[in-house]
Interface confidence: low
Amino acid sequence: LQDPCSNCPAGTFCDNNRNQICSPCPPNSFSSAGGQRTCDICRQCKGVFRTRKECSSTSNAECDCTPGFHCLGAGCSMCEQDCKQGQELTKKGCKDCCFGTFNDQKRGICRPWTNCSLDGKSVLVNGTKERDVVCGPSP
C-alpha cells in the first residue's frame, strides 16, 4: 500500500492530525524533500550573520557575514573577524605578523616566508608582512 504521505511535495508536510493531507509549511519553515512529516524551522541570520538567500518553503535560508567578518565552518556556521593583510587573529585580536612571516589575506594565520635556499635559489624580492619573498635564479 502506498504511503499517502509520499504524495506530499517539498514545501509541505504530511499532517497526521488532518487525515494525512499535505499542509503547507508555515511561514519561517521549510521542507526540502517530499513525504516529510514535519517542516524544519528556517535558519535566521541575526547579529553578525546576514541573509545571503532568503528561506523559502522548500529551502533553508543561507547566511554570510557582515562586512569586517568572514565565514567559518560548513554552511557558514560561524563568523570570524577579519584582520588586515599582514596580520593574524589571536585571542587578543588582530596582531601583526612576526618578522619572517606573512599573510596576504584578511583571514588565516601568518605563514613563514619561503626559504629560497632550500631550492638552491636566491632571494630576488624581500618578503614583507603582507607578501612572501620572491625567489630568483640560483646564485
Epitope: 509520499s6 504524495n7 506530499c8 511535495p9 517539498a10 514545501g11 509541505t12 488532518r18 493531507i21 499535505c22 499542509s23 503547507p24 509549511c25 508555515p26 511561514p27 517530499g34 523559502s56 518553503s57
Partner: antibody, heavy 117, light 107 residues
Framework: QVQLKESGPGLVAPSQSLSITCTVS????????ISWVRQPPGKGLEWLGI???????NYNSALKSRLSISKDNSRSQVFLKMNSLQTDDTARYYC???????????WGAGTTVTVSS | DIQMTQSTSSLSASVGDRVTISCSAS??????LNWYQQKPDGTVKLLIY???SLHSGVPSRFSGSGSGTDYSLTISNLEPEDIATYYC?????????FGGGTKLEIK
C-alpha cells in the same frame, strides 16, 4: 514569461459535469502548485482546491464530493472537473499559481461558465 | 471553516488619501494572510503575502499589518489606478477562504 490560461465550455446544462483546463507556460508543474478559485457574478472569490507539484490534492470541503483536480505535467495542463452542476455554480473560474509561502502570485484571466438549460 | 469578514463592502476616497481596508478572521490565523487586488476587468493580482510582505513589483504605497484575528491593508497615497476590489485570504487552515471583498472607488 509566466502565464496561465483557462479554457472551458462556456455553457453547461444543469446536472451535467464541468471540465476546465488550465494551460501554463513559463514554469513547470513539477515545481509549482496550482489552485482553482471561482467567482459567481457580483460576488466574492471562493477557493476550490489545489494540486501540489507531487500530484497530491486538497479540496474545499463544501465541494469535495463533486470536485476533482488532476494534471498532466508533460503537457503543462491542470484539469478541473465538477459534477452535478446547478445554477449557483455559474461563475468565472480562475486558475492561479501557488508559490512561496502559499500565496497565489500569478492568476489566469479566468473563464466564464454559465449553468443554464 | 475559518470565516473571513471584510466589514466594509465599499468605500470612496480621494486621490492622495490614505485608505485602510480591514479584515477579520473567525479565529486566530497566525499572520497567514494574503491580500489581492481585482480590477474591474476581473484581473487579479497579489499585493501582500504573510500579512506584511510586499510582493515584487507592487508599489510601496501598499502595506499590510495585523495579528491574531485582525488584519488591514493600507494604501498610503491613493492613485487613480487603485480603483479595484480588495480581498483578504487566509491560509492557516484548509479550506483556504477569502473575505467578501472591499470595493474602492475614487471620489
Amino acid at each position: 514569461q509566466v502565464q496561465l490560461k483557462e479554457s472551458g465550455p462556456g455553457l453547461v446544462a444543469p446536472s451535467q459535469s464541468l471540465s476546465i483546463t488550465c494551460t501554463v507556460s513559463g514554469f513547470s508543474l513539477t515545481t509549482y502548485a496550482i489552485s482553482w478559485v471561482r467567482q459567481p457574478p457580483g460576488k466574492g472569490l471562493e477557493w476550490l482546491g489545489i494540486i501540489w507539484p507531487g500530484g497530491g490534492t486538497n479540496y474545499n470541503s463544501a465541494l469535495k464530493s463533486r470536485l476533482s483536480i488532476s494534471k498532466d505535467n508533460s503537457r503543462s495542463q491542470v484539469f478541473l472537473k465538477m459534477n452535478s452542476l446547478q445554477t449557483d455554480d455559474t461563475a468565472r473560474y480562475y486558475c492561479a499559481r501557488g508559490a512561496g509561502t502559499w500565496y497565489f502570485d500569478v492568476w489566469g484571466a479566468g473563464t466564464t461558465v454559465t449553468v443554464s438549460s | 471553516d475559518i470565516q473571513m469578514t471584510q466589514s466594509t463592502s465599499s468605500l470612496s476616497a480621494s486621490v492622495g488619501d490614505r485608505v485602510t481596508i480591514s479584515c477579520s478572521a473567525s479565529q486566530g490565523i497566525s499572520n497567514y494572510l494574503n491580500w489581492y487586488q481585482q480590477k474591474p476587468d476581473g484581473t487579479v493580482k497579489l499585493l501582500i503575502y504573510y500579512t506584511s510582505s510586499l510582493h515584487s513589483g507592487v508599489p510601496s504605497r501598499f502595506s499590510g499589518s495585523g495579528s491574531g484575528t485582525d488584519y488591514s491593508l493600507t494604501i498610503s497615497n491613493l492613485e487613480p489606478e487603485d480603483i479595484a476590489t480588495y480581498y483578504c485570504q487566509q491560509y492557516s487552515k484548509f479550506p483556504w477562504t477569502f473575505g467578501g471583498g472591499t470595493k474602492l472607488e475614487i471620489k
